[in-house]
């Protein structure tokens, strides 16, 4: 349990979601300026 | 530990179409944490549950159900150890009861909102 | 969006019995983030497993959970009347490419 109350589960959940959107933001920033750059 | 709804129900859940509540939830015997996202759950008379969405505790980034389409609103005071739903546009199809929920395992009680003229 | 279809939406069975309940998702949910939840008249949904196999703390080990990607099941066995209840399914998703969330129609258990 992550403090004795909550399983880690849905917290462990929600950070794979933050990392997979932080890595969509940046992969979509590189691609547009890429696009921008040709 | 436990979750302590409040709005709507004994304190006026009764609400005429067009009209606006604020429903709220305070974490009790425990303190909201990043590793908390509460989320809101609504139950229609005789239906069954139906996710509107949730809100991070620690950093107040939310998201929400598809069909929500900006109609509410989450927001949470960690300070407070409180969390709360802002309905707008009420019309009697958002009569239900409206859960709490802390990463789906703590549930409040639910606040029954009924939506009439 | 996502949907996730339970069947039955009633079973009945004798005390001492084993009931089971299928929850099928499309899309797959991310990675076997399935919940299931119990709900009696009048109280809030009870957390029971989660990543579709472990059991909640406090949850007897006649529940249990199996499944991934599209297909999960719920099974009690040894049912006693105290697993009178509607049973939901819940399903977690990748947030980024559709709602985050889904629970599924709710399976109705009564105890003869």
């Known amino acids: 349990h992550s403090d004795g109350i909550f399983t880690d589960s849905y917290s462990r959940y929600r950070k794979q979601m933050a990392v997979k959107k932080y890595l969509a933001a940046v992969l979509g920033k590189r691609y547009k300026q890429r696009v921008k750059n040709k | 530990q436990q979750l302590e709804q409040s709005g709507g129900g004994a304190e006026g859940g009764l609400v005429k179409p067009g009209g606006s509540l604020e429903l709220c939830c305070k974490a009790?015997?425990?303190?909201?944490?990043?590793?908390?996202?509460m989320c809101w759950v609504r139950q229609a008379p005789g239906k069954g549950l139906n996710w509107i969405g949730c809100?991070?505790?620690?950093?107040?980034?939310?998201d929400y159900a598809t069909w929500v389409d900006a109609q509410f609103t989450l927001s949470r005071d960690i300070d407070q150890n409180t969390g709360c739903l802002q309905l707008n546009s009420l019309t009697p199809a958002d009569t239900a009861m409206y859960y709490c929920?802390?990463?789906?395992?703590?549930w409040g009680q639910g606040t029954l909102v009924t939506v009439s003229s | 969006a996502q949907v996730l279809t339970q069947t039955p939406s009633s079973v009945s069975a004798a005390v001492g019995g084993t009931v089971t309940i299928n929850c099928q998702s499309s899309?797959?949910?991310?990675?076997?983030?399935l919940s299931w939840f119990q709900q009696k008249p009048g109280q809030p949904p009870k957390f029971l497993i989660y990543?579709?196999?472990k059991l909640a703390s406090g949850v007897p080990s006649r529940f249990s959970g199996s499944g991934s990607g599209t297909q999960f099941t719920l099974t009690i066995s040894g049912v006693q009347c105290s697993d009178a209840a509607t049973y939901y399914c819940?399903?977690?998703?990748?947030?980024?490419?559709?709602?985050?969330?889904?629970f599924g129609g709710g399976t109705e258990v009564v105890v003869k």
């Open positions: 929920t802390i990463n789906f395992e703590l």
């Open positions: 009790s015997g425990f303190s909201l944490t990043t590793s908390h996202w």
């Open positions: 809100i991070s505790a620690g950093s107040g980034d939310a």
């Open positions: 899309p797959s949910v991310y990675s076997s983030y």
């Open positions: 990543e579709a196999s």
């Open positions: 819940l399903g977690a998703y990748d947030c980024g490419r559709t709602d985050c969330h889904a």
